[in-house]
Amino acid sequence: TQNKALPENVKYGIVLDAGSSHTSLYIYKWPAEKENDTGVVHQVEECRVKGPGISKFVQKVNEIGIYLTDCMERAREVIPRSQHQETPVYLGATAGMRLLRMESEELADRVLDVVERSLSNYPFDFQGARIITGQEEGAYGWITINYLLGKFSQKTRWFSIVPYETNNQETFGALDLGGASTQVTFVPQNQTIESPDNALQFRLYGKDYNVYTHSFLCYGKDQALWQKLAKDIQVASNEILRDPCFHPGYKKVVNVSDLYKTPCTKRFEMTLPFQQFEIQGIGNYQQCHQSILELFNTSYCPYSQCAFNGIFLPPLQGDFGAFSAFYFVMKFLNLTSEKVSQEKVTEMMKKFCAQPWEEIKTSYAGVKEKYLSEYCFSGTYILSLLLQGYHFTADSWEHIHFIGKIQGSDAGWTLGYMLNLTNMIPAEQPLSTPLSHSTYV
């Protein structure tokens, strides 16, 4: 008789990141017998769900099931059938749904209810759909990148197995930029966290961490743009908005009703003598930067120091991983290299924003126009947020590492979320068996 290969003793987990602009499904895999080891879980698949974020389905909840089908079917393909029933599925919704909940708890619940019913129809072990807090989003992003960078491992190695490893156990801070919110999370140096809301205490692998985190709702790149447009149209003399954050020659018609649809623009809302206005790009980095700065209130701070809008921020400490839209935008602009100084980034942004729209479309044929048109704004916004918002300087800029993936897994909150919910990050250091780290040899 022929020898049968022993079945691979692995486990799988699925996390859906229901973001403000879109939903992505991540599939993770790990060896069953090494659940408590650090760094063993890795991403095997990412599937981007076609269409907008789930909050946009508020008036058409009946379409949610079909919306999730393609990626859930992909998960069914990737994960062996014998493992389906024991594979947990989690859905975490972020700032898009936080905003919807602010407008109507009932509508947000209805969307989540339909999502739950749809996901329950698959052969996996569905564990629920919920709106995660901004604090969780920051914390899980921090856990993800430090887990993948091997920062929780007590083993010291004479060689680096992951990028950015400085061969010490000092954790990286996490900078996450989404469409509707942005998070900053790090371990401050011997600094008391002056606002309890921003303080987290973890015990991971036998070590205590006092972590600062804050999530700025409405300061993701898409909502920041809506805020900026709402602010600028207040002072426009007619239905033409000459906007320095878009390329010269770019034109786009915006409905006033769309502008005021989000709670993020409420503070700028006013009765306008028109239903639509036209953005006309003029492509000027400096003016765009100035306009963006007006979104950050730095005049009020009840603490020893603040980021903006009166939110406590301790002095920055150590290296930071900047991921999600921080990475996607800077990657497109070719500005992720460690060698590119902040001054060089600013210089490149000035040149990029000044390029005519027709030229940009030709140079970047194949890049979806919606995204292409907004890179000038997004790049300028990232610089403004990091420098004026979080107080990075030309010198500390080199401590920001723009990270897409670490060891093949996307940087983001989803892995940390799953590690936590599956109890795969122990509070104490697991007893090491003689062979548990033979892979280092």
Epitope: G51, R74, A365, E369, K370
Partner: antibody
Framework: QVQLKETGPGLVQPTQTLSITCTVS????????TQWVRQTPGKGLEWMGF???????QYNSAFKSRLSISRDTSKNQVFLKMNSLKTEDTGVYYC?????????????????WGQGASVTVSS | DIRMTQSPASLSASLGETVNIECLAS??????LAWYQKKPGKSPQLLIY???ALQNGVPSRFSGSGSGTHFSLKINSLQSEDVATYFC?????????FGGGTKLELR
Amino acid sequence: QVQLKETGPGLVQPTQTLSITCTVSGFSLTSYFTQWVRQTPGKGLEWMGFIRSGGSTQYNSAFKSRLSISRDTSKNQVFLKMNSLKTEDTGVYYCARDRPDYHDGTYGVLDVWGQGASVTVSS
Amino acid sequence: DIRMTQSPASLSASLGETVNIECLASEDIDSDLAWYQKKPGKSPQLLIYNGNALQNGVPSRFSGSGSGTHFSLKINSLQSEDVATYFCQQYINYPYTFGGGTKLELR
């Protein structure tokens, strides 16, 4: 090279069932989606449905429960069956390949089409 | 279902001319739009996907633009082999839907 070829009956009686086979070469049915689209004089190009690389199906609800798509991967064949035919179902039936890009969320782009199977529904 | 409206339904142009064909979606489809060329008796050929990405092997005189609800296909310096019917298709939502087509002839 990549090819898809439809074979069908040509003429079908009203109320009868239409069966078309799409035989593919140059790619694997387990890596691509196979879509069905028809072109009728009354409605132009109409998307009918598809079978995913994993074997699950998606249908246009306009065809209600009349339509079924299946496959035999060992023979590199995809099958379309549609019952209760009417004269309005007369047209050309195409199978086409769809390369799903999961990372980008791009699926539904038909990059290679078969030559089409002409179907006339008449008594 | 998302309705895709193409204009014009037919048009005549001279060799070497630039031609524009419009496609309007009944709701926002982001950039999930493809353009196909169909010649009589032949199967459709993919030209453009994601609104503006040129399919491999398609001449660079073809270009697509637009996002949201308004899209256009541009043919620079029209050649005789471009005489065909052009269709747009959205693939953001099921059921996928096609425009009614634009028949392009030589003047």
